[in-house]
C-alpha cells in the first residue's frame, strides 16, 4: 500500500548525465531500510506505457544506468522508481523531463601537454561518447556539438595569462621562458547549449635551454 508520504521511502529521483552517460540516481527516505528494493521504468515524451529496465528490477542499489535506453539525442525521456519496503509499503517517484543534449554535463577534455624549450604544445584528444551513429560507430562530442570549441589558458605568472582557442586539436603557446613552470587549463565550450566543461589542468615546465652550455 502507499505510504502516507512517498518521500518517506524515496527521494531525489533524478538523472545524472555526463558526456551522454545517463545514470538514474535516487536516495532512500527516512523510512527506507537496506532491504528496500527498487524497480526502474522509463518512457519517452507523450507515450503512455512505461518500460521496465532489465537489470534494474528489485535492486537494492540506488542507481541504474539508462544510457542505452536514453540514447536518442532529440528525444525527451522520463524515468521512475518504485520503492518497496520489507513491510510491503511502496512509493513511486518520477524524474523531470530529461534531454541528454540539454542536461548532460561535459567532463574535462583528454589532453596531452608537451614541453619544449620556449613553447608548450597541447594536443586535445577527441572525446568519445556512448552515442552511436547509424552505422554503429561511436560519436565524439565534436560530432554531436558542431559549434564545440576549446579554450586554452596558460598561466605565465600571477598577473599574466596567455589564451588560445579554436576548433582544431593542436595548439602551441610560444615565446616562453626556458626551464620555467606553467599551469595550463583546457576547457570544452559549447555556446549553443551554454555548456562549459570542467578544466583539464596540466602543470608543465619548459625544457632548459641547452644551447648556452
Amino acid at each position: 500500500h502507499a505510504p502516507e508520504d512517498p518521500s518517506d521511502l524515496l527521494q531525489h529521483v533524478k538523472f545524472q548525465s555526463s558526456n551522454f552517460e545517463n545514470i538514474l540516481t535516487w536516495d532512500s527516505g527516512p523510512e527506507g531500510t537496506p532491504d528496500t528494493v527498487y524497480s526502474i521504468e522509463y518512457k519517452t515524451y507523450g507515450e503512455r506505457d512505461w518500460v521496465a529496465k532489465k537489470g534494474c528490477q528489485r535492486i537494492t542499489r540506488k542507481s541504474c544506468n539508462l544510457t542505452v535506453e536514453t540514447g536518442n539525442l532529440t528525444e525527451l525521456y522520463y524515468a521512475r522508481v518504485t520503492a518497496v519496503s520489507a513491510g510491503g509499503r511502496s512509493a513511486t517517484k518520477m524524474t523531470d523531463r530529461f534531454s541528454s543534449l540539454q542536461h548532460t554535463t561535459l567532463k574535462p577534455p583528454d589532453v596531452t601537454c608537451i614541453s619544449k624549450v620556449r613553447s608548450i604544445q597541447m594536443i586535445v584528444h577527441p572525446t568519445p561518447t556512448p552515442i552511436r551513429a547509424g552505422d554503429g560507430h561511436r560519436l565524439t562530442l565534436e560530432d554531436i556539438f558542431h559549434d564545440l570549441f576549446y579554450h586554452l589558458e596558460l598561466q605565465v605568472n600571477r598577473t599574466y595569462q596567455m589564451h588560445l582557442g579554436g576548433k582544431q586539436r593542436e595548439y602551441e603557446f610560444f615565446g616562453l621562458t626556458p626551464d620555467t613552470e606553467f599551469l595550463g587549463t583546457i576547457m570544452i565550450c559549447v555556446p549553443t547549449w551554454a555548456k562549459e566543461s570542467a578544466p583539464y589542468m596540466c602543470r608543465v615546465k619548459t625544457l632548459p635551454d641547452r644551447t648556452w652550455t
Epitope: 512517498p6 519517452t44 515524451y45 507523450g46 528525444e75 512509493a91 513511486t92 518520477m94
Partner: antibody, heavy 116, light 113 residues
Framework: EVQLVESGGGLVQPGGSLRLSCAAS????????MNWVRQAPGKGLEWIGE????????TYNQKFKGRATLSVDQSKNTAYLQMNSLRAEDTAVYYC?????????WGQGTLVTVSS | DIVMTQSPDSLAVSLGERATINCKSS????????????LAWYQQKPGQPPKLLIY???SRESGVPDRFSGSGSGTDFTLTISSLQAEDVAVYYC?????????FGQGTKVEIK
C-alpha cells in the same frame, strides 16, 4: 480506477485569491504529471500550467505566470492551484488533468466566479 | 505560442453521415524524435470535462469507438466521425503538445441535422 476530484471553487471578490484542490485516487500522484486547464463559460480550453508532483518542478503558461502557483502535498495525494489578483475574466471552470503532453484523465471541474 | 484554428465553428450532420472537423496549427507539430505529430483531439459534452479521443494525431484512445479517426501531418489535421451517432453531439477540441504553452483550438460544435 483513476479519479481526480477538484474542490475549492466558489464566489471570489475581484482582487481576491483562491486555492483549488485536486484529490487523486486510484494511482499515486507522484507517478505522473498534473496539469491545470480552465474554461470560461461558453468558451474554449486554456492551459494554465503543469507540475511534476515528484519534484515540484513547474511550467506555467506565461499568461498566468506570477498569478498562478502550482503545488502538491504528496502525503495527501493532492495537487493545488493558487490564483491571486483575480478579476472578472478569471471566472471559469477549473480542471485538473493528468499526463505530460495530452490529458488522459480529467476531474469534473470546479467553478470559480469572480464578482463583487 | 502555437495558434490552433479549427473549422468549421459548428456543423450539423445527419445521423449515420460523416462529420469532418479540421484543425490547423501555426507551425508544424511533427516531432522529429518519432516522426509523429503532437496533436490530440477531445470531445466535450455539456456539463462534463473533455474526454481524450485521439493522441499523436491518429492513435485512438482505449475505449473510443472506431468511428472516430484522426489524420493529418505537419500543420493540417482532421478528426473524422465516419457515421454520426446521437451520442456524438458535443464540442470537439484539438490540442497541440509540441511546445509550451500547450494550446487548444477554439472548438467545433457538432449537432444533428
Amino acid at each position: 480506477e483513476v479519479q481526480l476530484v477538484e474542490s475549492g471553487g466558489g464566489l471570489v471578490q475581484p482582487g481576491g485569491s483562491l486555492r483549488l484542490s485536486c484529490a487523486a485516487s486510484g494511482y499515486s500522484l507522484t507517478a505522473d504529471y498534473m496539469n491545470w486547464v480552465r474554461q470560461a463559460p461558453g468558451k474554449g480550453l486554456e492551459w494554465i500550467g503543469e507540475i511534476n508532483p515528484s519534484t515540484g518542478t513547474t511550467t506555467y503558461n506565461q499568461k498566468f505566470k506570477g498569478r498562478a502557483t502550482l503545488s502538491v502535498d504528496q502525503s495527501k495525494n493532492t495537487a493545488y492551484l493558487q490564483m491571486n489578483s483575480l478579476r472578472a475574466e478569471d471566472t471559469a471552470v477549473y480542471y485538473c488533468a493528468r499526463f505530460d503532453a495530452y490529458f488522459d484523465y480529467w476531474g469534473q471541474g470546479t467553478l470559480v466566479t469572480v464578482s463583487s | 505560442d502555437i495558434v490552433m484554428t479549427q473549422s468549421p465553428d459548428s456543423l450539423a450532420v445527419s445521423l449515420g453521415e460523416r462529420a469532418t472537423i479540421n484543425c490547423k496549427s501555426s507551425q508544424s507539430l511533427l516531432y522529429s524524435s518519432n516522426q509523429k505529430n503532437t496533436l490530440a483531439w477531445y470531445q466535450q459534452k455539456p456539463g462534463q470535462p473533455p474526454k481524450l479521443l485521439i493522441y499523436w494525431a491518429s492513435s485512438r484512445e482505449s475505449g473510443v469507438p472506431d468511428r472516430f479517426s484522426g489524420s493529418g501531418s505537419g500543420t493540417d489535421f482532421t478528426l473524422t466521425i465516419s457515421s454520426l451517432q446521437a451520442e456524438d453531439v458535443a464540442v470537439y477540441y484539438c490540442q497541440q503538445y509540441f511546445s509550451y504553452p500547450f494550446t487548444f483550438g477554439q472548438g467545433t460544435k457538432v449537432e444533428i441535422k
